[in-house]
């Protein structure tokens, strides 16, 4: 029985050229997190493996920084970075939990963070 929930930063916006932190947090379960995959529309950005640590995809080495924690920092944002991002928590014994974040990269200097929300 999967009892956990993933809390994410929800819908967020950021300025072109700036940085943003993508964060997910798994709660309400004692399952062990074995690996977290960060994806952007089916493309793998990075992996944080419990035994092997952080690994960044060749597509994103120059623009992605690990952390904080199990989160991911996107740098040098472009308008093309607008879209859905997913944190996929692989856990034992529960299985897989997925959180969704929507990032909008704005041309203007007005970029407000959205509210947090939960995905069961």
């Amino acid at each position: 029985m999967m009892t956990g929930t993933i809390e994410t930063t929800g819908n967020i916006s950021a300025e072109k050229g700036g940085s943003i932190i993508l964060q997910c947090h798994l709660s309400s379960t004692t399952a062990q997190v074995t690996q977290v995959n960060w994806e952007q529309q089916d493309q793998l950005l990075a992996i944080c493996n419990a035994d092997l640590g952080w690994h960044i995809s060749p597509s994103f080495k120059d623009r992605v920084a690990p952390g904080p924690g199990l989160g991911l920092t996107l740098q040098s944002l472009t308008v093309n970075d607008t879209g859905e991002y997913f944190c996929i928590y692989h856990t034992y014994p529960d299985g897989t939990y997925t959180g969704r974040i929507f990032l909008e990269v704005l041309e203007s200097s007005v970029a407000e963070h959205g509210a947090r929300f939960q995905i069961p």
Epitope: N37, A46, I47, W54, H55, I56, P58, P66, I88, T96
Partner: antibody
């Protein structure tokens, strides 16, 4: 000892689809420490990486932008192999096509090519 | 794309002499996060696929003779064959696996003088 055995046609007509298969022995296509690539070589383009498939708790693909609109690389876990499909072939796609294992050592998402298939000369001609 | 440029295009060296092949990348292939250099060297003989010689710029692949060595940092790399043997006649390629698309140098043809 890892071995990669390629199969598929050597002649393809223009506008048709190239289908090649790479059978793996001595490793698993679902390995968490490898990725499975297709690379081609021609006198005009040299060695050109086309794309890869790999499993890291789920399946992923990465493709070269130059062929992204017409390439598909699929794993077949039941046969322990992976395939290349390249659509809309033109004479410029004439090349020797290789499959290769990318060993993920120290970095589980990138590595060098430590095992290669024997190569398949593919000619695109009517 | 990262462009890999090798020099020279061809090289003739006497048996037993040192052979040096250079490779330059258009941008750094050193990843600061893990301090690894994402560069490999391959040897290709006629009618055969490339064979891995060196990875992480300087680590020799298992079974590769110790006369082959790799060095370099950032954007400039060298493959050295300390004492050329007849079986070393081949085309040599460098390759970066830092970012997509993975790219290769144009090759250096090594012959015996």
């Amino acid at each position: 000892q890892v071995q990669l055995q390629q199969s598929g046609p050597g002649l393809v007509k223009p506008s048709q689809t190239l289908s090649l298969t790479c059978a793996i022995s001595g490793d698993s296509v679902s390995s968490n420490s490898a990725a499975w690539n297709w690379i081609r070589q021609s006198p005009s383009r040299g060695l050109e990486w086309l794309g890869r498939t790999y499993f890291r708790s789920k399946w992923y693909n990465d493709y070269a932008v130059s062929v992204k609109s017409r390439i598909t690389i699929n794993p077949d876990t039941s046969k322990n192999q992976f395939s290349l499909q390249l659509n809309s072939m033109t004479p410029e796609d004439t090349a020797v096509y290789y499959c290769a294992r990318e060993r993920a050592l120290y970095d589980i998402l990138a590595g060098s090519f430590d095992y290669w298939g024997q190569g398949t000369l593919v000619t695109v001609s009517s | 794309d990262i462009v890999m440029t090798q020099s020279p295009d061809s090289l003739a060296v006497s048996l037993g002499e040192r052979a040096t092949i250079n490779c330059k990348s258009s941008q750094s292939v050193l990843f600061g996060f893990n301090n690894k250099i994402y560069l490999a060297w391959y040897q290709q003989k006629p009618g055969q696929p490339p064979e891995l010689l060196i990875y992480w710029a300087s680590t020799r692949e298992s079974g590769v003779p110790d006369r082959f060595s790799g060095s370099g940092s950032g954007t400039d790399f060298t493959l050295t064959i300390s004492s050329l043997q007849a079986e070393d006649v081949a085309v040599y390629y460098c390759q970066q696996y830092y970012s997509f698309p993975y790219t290769f140098g144009q090759g250096t043809k090594l012959e015996i003088k």
